[in-house]
Interface confidence: low
């Protein structure tokens, strides 16, 4: 047998919200479940569909979902069928509608003192509670001679009078929510004694010093009073005008005239009509002073031929809003064509070179006119005046490579050396016309150079090879003073380069020939064994065919190189005693001795009373202190060479003698006894 585990049950539902009718069955065989609504099968839709055995509602609809739902389970094999209990929705909803006149039958029949009934067509379930409004203000029961039933949808005004005139609206709420009238009803009950508008003032915009007129008329029986006010409630009459409205005139027909308008006259003017009965009727109008501000400047524009470009004219702020137009060569641009105006934009379609020039954006209103020019340049691709050419540049002199081009606008030229961009520095300079100057040409400047000339329209480029014509020069130049060690072998090198490999030879400055033990071997002067006579002035001569010859003069000195006869030793001294650091050097010329102590040269003229350097080079330090400890360097130097030797000095405390030590016991380290 088919058994319902869960049966659908009647329930509350909200219009447009989700809902679910549950149904679950158990059966021995295979059953299929479907639903009935008022006995008819339910078809699945996106809004209402079966979900398992249950019926799901994405959005309950009060019209389509009213009725009785039933879940049916059927065994297709046995034909057995079971039906659930009936279930239905109690759908809560509310729907807006208009306020309509119920009595009398038409607006034409509404007269003062008649009964007027309005009906609020807001419907809902459960039955809504209603609230009425006049001109947005809630009405309550019995208020100002009207009978209102807040539970009813009708509003009865008995009797209706002019004071009931206004815009009637209603709102209603129930358990579902709230809705307000979709269309409101304007009740107009004329009372001849009420002021009624015949002519309302309009906002005006006037230029400075012009005149402004506001018209204002009311009608009533008896005739109404009319009063004008400005801004801060200042009354305007022909008898009492405020100081800033001296030129205001109120005419008998209610019109207000302002002459020679000034900025302080701008603002809100109110015209007030007051009948014998009823509220004052207030009409407002604003006087604006026409004005126009300056236009922002245009940046010059550069366009390329064949492209489409637009230039937007930012109109100046103005009141009234200024009209804007473009002119070229004094002629207003059309609204179509190749060069035309579209809105505030200047449009140049398929730009030609002839389109270049000054275009003017004009803006004008009551306050005046403004204009602003924009200079439009049509860019062209550069053309050659002079291309860079393969060049031979002389080493050490300035060299020039030309890259002369012409275009609109003036082209920018950049240079590359070996594919690397040349940035201007002390050696390279790019002139305004595109020429590259290489200051002080060097051998390695011989390479490829490329110049690129560009405008927004395109670029051209060309390259050239630079060959550097090397100057005849010594590489490196020989030292002008050199020393040779007496009785030793010595060499003095001399080499040179040029456009052609130069020939190098040595000679004595006095023109005498070189002795047999001195040889000139491919520019190297070789002394097999230096003698005193080898000292003197020598000249190295380098020469080649195209460049002639160059000379380098060298003064050779023969010297006995420095050796130390006495070197300072590692020395330890008691604090307060005297330290002696001996140093003696020999050589020719006779060497001078300098001492360096603790990383600074000891200046003999600034040693103070404790230190002294003897003629023979020894350093003596009296009354030594711990801070005198450190490394001391003896430096021996003459015009030919320099040598140094160093030793540490230790300053220690004198030990107190122990009983066991005899007077003749030696100290544990080498001491200088003083």
């Amino acid at each position: 047998a088919i058994v319902f585990i869960k049966q659908p049950s009647s329930q509350d539902a909200l219009q447009g919200r989700r809902a679910l009718l549950r149904c679950e069955v158990e059966a021995p065989g295979l059953v299929h479940v479907y639903w009935l609504l008022d006995g008819a099968p339910v078809q699945d839709t996106e809004r209402r569909f079966t979900q398992g055995s249950s019926l799901s509602f994405a959005a309950v609809d009060r019209l389509q979902d009213s009725g009785t739902f039933q879940c049916v389970a059927r065994d297709d094999v046995t034909g057995e069928e079971a039906r659930s209990a009936n279930a239905s929705f109690n759908i809560k909803w509310i729907e807006a509608g208009p306020v309509v006149l119920k009595h009398p039958a038409s607006e034409a029949e509404i007269q003062p003192q008649t009964q007027v009934t309005l009906r609020c067509h807001i419907d809902g379930h459960p039955r809504p509670t209603y609230q009425w409004f006049r001109d947005g203000t809630p009405l309550s029961d019995g208020q100002s001679n009207n009978t209102v039933s807040s539970k009813e949808r009708n509003l009865t005004l008995r009797p209706a009078g002019p004071e009931h005139s206004g815009l009637y609206s209603c709102c209603a709420h129930n358990a579902f929510g709230q809705a307000c009238s979709s269309q409101n009803f304007t009740l107009s009950i004329a009372d001849e004694s009420f002021a009624r508008v015949v002519l309302a003032p309009q906002d005006v915009i006037v230029a400075r010093n012009e005149e402004a007129m506001f018209h204002c008329q009311f009608s009533a029986q008896p005739p109404p009073n009319l009063q004008w006010l400005f801004e801060d409630e200042t009354p305007i009459t022909n008898r009492s005008r405020p100081p800033h409205l001296r030129r205001a005139t109120v005419f008998a027909n209610g019109s207000l005239l302002l002459t020679q308008v000034r900025p302080r006259n701008a603002g809100v003017y109110r015209c007030i009509g007051q009948g014998q009965r009823g509220p004052p009727v207030i009409l407002e109008a604003t006087l604006h002073l026409a004005e126009i501000e300056d236009m922002p400047l245009f940046e010059p524009r550069v366009f390329t031929a064949g492209s489409e470009e637009r230039v937007t004219c930012l109109p100046p702020k103005g009141l009234p809003e200024p009209s804007v137009w473009w002119e070229h060569a004094g002629v207003r641009l059309p609204t179509h064509g190749r060069v035309y105006q579209k809105g505030h934009e200047l449009v140049l379609a398929s730009i030609a070179e002839s389109d270049a020039g000054v275009y003017t954006c004009h803006a004008a209103n009551l306050a005046g006119q403004r204009r602003q020019d924009v200079n439009i340049t049509v860019a062209t691709v550069p053309t050659w005046l002079k291309k860079p050419q393969d060049s031979q540049l002389e080493e050490g002199k300035p060299g020039y490579l030309h890259c002369l081009t012409q275009a609109t606008p003036k082209p920018t030229v950049v240079w590359y050396r070996n594919q690397m961009l040349i940035s201007e520095d002390s050696r390279f300079e790019v002139f305004k016309n595109g020429t590259l100057r290489i200051n002080n040409v060097e051998v390695y400047d011989g390479t490829w150079y490329r110049c690129v000339s560009s405008t927004p329209a395109g670029s051209i480029e060309a390259q050239a090879r630079v060959q550097v014509l090397e100057k005849l020069k010594f590489t490196p130049p020989p030292q002008p003073q050199q020393c040779m060690e007496f009785d030793k072998e010595a060499t003095v090198p001399c080499s040179a380069t040029g456009r052609e490999k130069p020939t190098i030879k040595w000679e004595r400055a006095d023109g005498s020939s070189l002795p047999e033990w001195v040889t000139d071997n491919a520019g190297t002067l070789h002394f097999a064994r230096v003698t005193r006579d080898d000292a003197g002035n020598y000249t190295c001569i380098a020469s080649n065919g195209p460049q002639g010859q160059i000379r380098a003069h060298v003064q050779l000195t023969v010297a006995v190189f420095i050796t130390f006869k006495v070197e300072p030793e590692r020395t330890t001294v008691y604090q307060g005693h005297t330290a002696l650091l001996q140093c003696e050097a020999q050589g020719d010329p006779k060497p001078l001795i300098q001492w360096k102590g603790k990383d600074r040269i000891l200046d003999p003229t600034k040693l103070g009373p404790r230190m002294h350097i003897f003629q023979n080079g020894s350093l003596v330090i009296h009354d030594v202190a711990p801070e005198d400890s450190g490394r001391y360097t003896c430096i021996a130097g003459n015009s030919c060479n320099i040598k140094h030797t160093e030793a540490p000095l230790y300053v220690v405390d004198k030990p107190v003698p122990e009983e066991s030590e005899g007077p003749g016991s030696p100290p544990p380290y080498k001491m200088i006894q003083t």
């Epitope: 603002g267 604003t286 604006h288 002073l289 004005e291 501000e293 930012l314 702020k317 103005g318 809003e321």
Partner: nanobody, 130 residues
């Protein structure tokens, strides 16, 4: 809803520099010209500078060469870099998203509330002392 929030105001010595920022939300920033105004005590609103939606820059004569306007569409922000400031630059500085229809002087005079400007910020005070 639409919001424009200025920041960066404060006190600065004459000759000094200041950077004002204005961050926008609630509207399509790229579509609007962004504008800086200022109002000194007792004075009308004064237009200072505009950066158009296309990126063109415009300046009032009183600030040309001293103030620089810029915009960052990715950050919905407009900036005003103030340099070489003078005591007469003391004012409340406002930024606005400008629809370009009505001049600022008109708005300042005839509008009794902020509702009748396009989109305006609340302002940031800048005080320049000598």
């Amino acid at each position: 809803q639409v919001q424009l929030q200025e920041s960066g105001g404060g006190s600065v010595q004459a000759g000094g520099s200041l950077r004002l920022s204005c961050t926008a939300s609630g509207f399509t920033f790229d579509d609007y010209d962004m504008v800086w105004y200022r109002q000194a005590p007792g004075n009308e609103y004064e237009w200072l500078s505009t950066v158009s939606r296309g990126g063109n820059l415009y300046y009032a004569d009183s600030v040309k060469g001293r103030f620089t306007i810029s915009r960052d569409n990715a950050k919905n922000t407009v900036y005003l870099n103030m340099s070489r400031v003078k005591p007469e630059d003391t004012a409340v500085y406002y930024c606005a998203a400008d629809l370009r229809s009505v001049p600022s002087t008109y708005r300042a005079r005839t509008c009794r509330g902020r509702y009748c400007r396009d989109y305006w910020g609340q302002g940031t005070q800048v005080t320049v002392s000598s």
